[in-house]
Interface confidence: low
């Protein structure tokens, strides 16, 4: 079983899923309002968003004193955060600016991918090897959407029997999408295009917030019980609390290289020939060159106009 990395508003913590009764290790302490968290295992980096400081920060997990600011302007409520470990990019949602943005892992070359028809975007999950991204929106018209990680092919995949979709996670091995609904109190799963929807845990969960997966097991944080719970991902069997008495459990991830499988990086050679951003794409050649917001891509599809 994995280590679970979770945000706890005042800190980020790691807890062993098999021994959750023991104290969690504080990875980064003294935080204001840590909400979302993710990591790039191969680089030894942990990222988090702080909704009070309106910032995204990072640390090297072997050097906990080395906190760096990544994005510090133009954020209001960065509720969701996801690292593209393959293309080495950072994606985030902001439920107040109503945007989904992308940047390099250091925060440079920032680009707004989506800014329309977003109300309360929250969880975001990436599948870099297929070039797709997924996010939940718990606004007036709640839904789960999918799009290319380059901003293409946006599509609503779930928009029925959905109210407060909070947690979202992908099963890369079995090509499934799992999500938790805090109002309808369930965890459901579907194919990655939203078809073949099935209940995993029927409406019995008090207030599930964030969701992750490792091998056969789903793990999630619950605001009502102040705990991390788990169950079998196929059957929902064995539902149990594995770590309790958490101050304010927020985002959660299974902290393991297994959750960030290696694959061919289409941007790996010479940044795909792109002058600036090279983003994963679901269509051949499986990458798309892009420019920071406000800068035009020239007709060659590779180079951004001078002044970027």
């Amino acid at each position: 079983a994995p280590l679970l990395l979770y945000a706890n508003r005042r800190d980020l913590r790691l807890v062993d899923a098999t021994n959750g009764k023991e104290n969690a290790t504080i990875v980064v302490g003294g935080l204001e309002d840590a909400a979302a968290v993710d990591f790039v295992f191969s680089h030894g980096l942990i990222y988090w968003s702080d909704v009070s400081e309106e910032a995204i920060k990072r640390t090297e997990f072997n050097k906990t004193e080395s906190v760096q600011n990544v994005v510090v302007s133009g954020l209001l409520s960065p509720d969701g955060l996801a690292c593209d470990w393959l293309g080495e990019k950072l994606y985030w949602t902001d439920s107040e600016t109503n945007r989904i943005e992308v940047s390099n892992l250091d925060g440079s070359l920032r680009k707004v991918l989506f800014w329309q028809e977003l109300d309360q975007p929250r969880a975001i999950a990436l599948d870099p090897s297929s070039g797709f991204m997924y996010w939940t929106d718990w606004g007036e018209v709640p839904k789960i959407e999918r799009a290319g990680m380059d901003g293409s092919s946006r599509f609503i995949i779930i928009n029925s029997e959905i109210y407060w979709p909070n947690g979202l996670t992908l099963d890369y091995e079995e090509q499934k999408l799992y999500w938790a609904d805090a109002k309808l109190n369930f965890i459901h799963k579907s194919n990655l295009d939203g078809t073949n929807r099935q209940a995993v845990v029927k409406g019995s969960l008090p207030h599930p917030f964030a969701l992750t997966l490792f091998e056969d097991i789903l793990y999630w944080t619950d605001w009502s019980t102040h705990s991390i719970l788990a169950c079998n991902k196929y059957t929902g069997e064995g539902l149990r609390e594995i770590h309790s008495d958490i101050f304010s459990p927020m985002d959660i991830h299974a902290f393991s290289q297994q959750r960030q499988p290696n694959a061919t990086n289409p941007c790996g050679i010479d940044n795909g020939g792109c002058s600036h951003l090279c983003l994963m794409s679901p269509v051949k050649p499986f990458y798309q060159c892009a420019c920071p917001t406000g800068v035009k891509l020239l007709e060659n599809g590779k180079t951004c106009k001078d002044g970027a």
């Epitope: 098999t18 021994n19 079995e174 097991i217 196929y234 069997e237």
Partner: antibody, heavy 121, light 112 residues
Framework: EIQLQQSGPELVKPGASVKVSCKAS????????MYWVKQSHGKSLEWIGY????????NYNQKFKGKATLTVDKSSSTAYMHLNSLTSEDSAVYYC??????????????WGQGTTLTVSS | DIVMSQSPSSLAVSVGEKVTMSCKSS????????????LAWYQQKPGQSPKVLIY???TRESGVPDRFTGSGSGTDFTLTISSVKAEDLAVYYC?????????FGGGTKLEI
């Protein structure tokens, strides 16, 4: 080191009852199901049932319903199996075995040393 | 209940020989959602508790020598010992954990 330490051999009379214990150490007791298995002399293995120490939930083989009762004491990380109305058919070695994390159907990765029960007048 | 049948019930071999034993289930143990076979193999040496060798039909438990190999899918499974050692004297059981009640095969007794 993960260990399952079972209580010693029992010699009891027909009609009596017995309680076999299995003390777990070296892992988070409430995170894993505890299974019980019967092995009659020179015979194969039979699954009796399991208990989920986290919530006390049980699942019995229909054949052993009414014969076996499974309980746990979380404070001492000990699982118990109570066998009642004993007959010579109940004479066997009984094993406790650790299963999966209560979250999945699973094989048994650690076994107790076995408790020999002899029912004889 | 799923019935597990093992064959042969016993076999005698010499040290260094290759051994195969069979286990058949009365219904498929392959779970379509994860393409895993819910079958385990155990070794029980005289006077000892069973010890798991193989799970998911073919995954070797850590610490188990690589001369032990599990194979098969669906209803037909095989345990192979590539080169038998004297310490392999034991009874070998297969077990399904696909559905309750979990059931074991009758065992194959390996004599050296």
């Amino acid at each position: 080191e993960i260990q399952l330490q079972q209580s010693g051999p029992e010699l009891v009379k027909p009609g009596a009852s017995v309680k076999v214990s299995c003390k777990a150490s070296g892992y988070a007791f409430t995170s894993y199901n505890m299974y019980w298995v019967k092995q009659s002399h020179g015979k194969s293995l039979e699954w009796i049932g399991y208990i989920d120490p986290y919530n006390g939930g049980t699942n019995y083989n229909q054949k052993f319903k009414g014969k076996a009762t499974l309980t746990v004491d979380k404070s001492s990380s000990t699982a118990y199996m109570h066998l009642n109305s004993l007959t010579s058919e109940d004479s066997a070695v009984y094993y406790c075995a650790r299963g999966g994390m209560g979250l999945r159907r699973d094989y048994f990765d650690f076994w107790g040393q076995g408790t020999t029960l002899t029912v004889s007048s | 209940d799923i019935v597990m049948s093992q064959s042969p019930s016993s076999l005698a071999v010499s040290v260094g020989e290759k051994v195969t034993m069979s286990c058949k289930s009365s219904q498929s143990l392959l779970y379509s959602s994860n393409q895993k076979n819910y079958l385990a193999w155990y070794q029980q040496k005289p006077g000892q508790s069973p010890k798991v060798l193989i799970y998911w039909a073919s995954t070797r438990e850590s610490g188990v020598p690589d001369r032990f190999t599990g194979s098969g899918s669906g209803t037909d499974f095989t345990l192979t010992i590539s080169s038998v050692k004297a310490e392999d004297l034991a009874v070998y059981y297969c077990q399904q954990y696909y559905s309750y009640p979990y059931t074991f095969g009758g065992g194959t007794k390996l004599e050296i």
